[in-house]
Amino acid sequence: MTKEYQDLQHLDNEESDHHQLRKGPPPPQPLLQRLCSGPRLLLLSLGLSLLLLVVVCVIGSQNSQLQEELRGLRETFSNFTASTEAQVKGLSTQGGNVGRKMKSLESQLEKQQKDLSEDHSSLLLHVKQFVSDLRSLSCQMAALQGNGSERTCCPVNWVEHERSCYWFSRSGKAWADADNYCRLEDAHLVVVTSWEEQKFVQHHIGPVNTWMGLHDQNGPWKWVDGTDYETGFKNWRPEQPDDWYGHGLGGGEDCAHFTDDGRWNDDVCQRPYRWVCETELDKASQEPPLL
């Protein structure tokens, strides 16, 4: 049963009671009728007025008091809000500062870690270089003590690769002078016998014209160490060698060099190009122990 239905039923009951009262015998004279007669009524009115006045005064007084309190509360709340806002603002600023500090600390830590990692790598490289230098020096000492007929390690500043030593010039010379320089170092201008060796040399010389140990001097093409040209590795640029005469310097082009892309070209042997010397390590010997 719903609440609305209960209420309706209650109203019905009240109404039926009222009907029952009217049907009964006449009631005695009501109290109000008795009170409202004559001076009693006046006194009652006065009393009620006074009471009402007192109530109004009390309520008025309480209202102003409440208003005062409300004003006070408003003021307090306003102050509290402002103070809270200021505090929140302050905290937010502090939070921002803390965040910034955190970020700064994080980046500092990151930088220090990076620096440390770089230092570590650098240290490892130095150690590696040190070990290599030590081995080289040890080998040089052994070579000096021996009769010098067999080379077991690369000279200082030479690069070892696949049992050969390579030296890369940083200045330029004519082919014949470069060839002579290498011979004085008990070496020869580089002889390229494989794609792997080509890539190694190319990596070290970069995109710079560099003489190699291949020439024809207008006879057959020959490698300076006697390696067979005809059956060996070749990496000429398209349409090369062309023994070009158009340069007007006399003769054609009789000496081979690496071009900027690593492929070979024949050129006038007098041009002052960089060069690469090569010498083979003794095949039978092993690296001497460090200690």
Epitope: N218, K234, Q240, D243, Y245
Partner: antibody, heavy 115, light 107 residues
Framework: EVQLVESGGGLVKPGGSLRLSCAAS????????MNWVRQAPGKGLEWVSS????????YYADSVKGRFTISRDNAKNSLYLQMNSLRAEDTAVYYC????????WGQGTLVTVSS | DIQMTQSPSSLSASIGDRITLTCRAS??????LAWFQQRPGKAPKSLIY???SLLSGVPSKFSGSGSGTDFTLTISSLQPEDFATYYC?????????FGGGTKVELK
Amino acid sequence: EVQLVESGGGLVKPGGSLRLSCAASGFTFSSYRMNWVRQAPGKGLEWVSSMSNSSSSIYYADSVKGRFTISRDNAKNSLYLQMNSLRAEDTAVYYCARQAAQDYWGQGTLVTVSS
Amino acid sequence: DIQMTQSPSSLSASIGDRITLTCRASQGISNYLAWFQQRPGKAPKSLIYAASSLLSGVPSKFSGSGSGTDFTLTISSLQPEDFATYYCQQYNSFPFTFGGGTKVELK
């Protein structure tokens, strides 16, 4: 072993044409400049024409310019000389030779221009 | 064009003789000079290139020298097979030119 073998010579009337061939073997033909040299009967050697390995650089003697054309086919290891408007003075043994310094020569092929 | 002049045009010599042939260029040709030997009825054969470099397979009795305009070919000890005509050729610039030749005959 380097070998150069000429062919295509023969008897031709003045104003006629001939095409000489030179077959190369025993070396990387595509790496070398090639030449034609001729020798008139009882005379000295005369350079005729030259072509670089890639055909990019071609030269002719003044005496044959405009009449002779040198060419090569690196895939076939062959050198050619197309001779047009032949004259009596073109009669000679024609040799193909390798490199500017002519380090290797063929055995020659005889061209006779006569009416 | 560069003119090449050989001298003498002919030379008589005996077996075992040392002979020197000369070749002169009308202008400087650096070392761009070759020497050839031609026996009667045969194709020329290369002896020397770059003025002094001996071609492989050529006996060491042959030697060349010179630079610029004056060049020489020397045969240290003449043998029967050396009697032939010798030519020089410049390849400094086109057109390539040959000398007139020196005929070496048996005395």
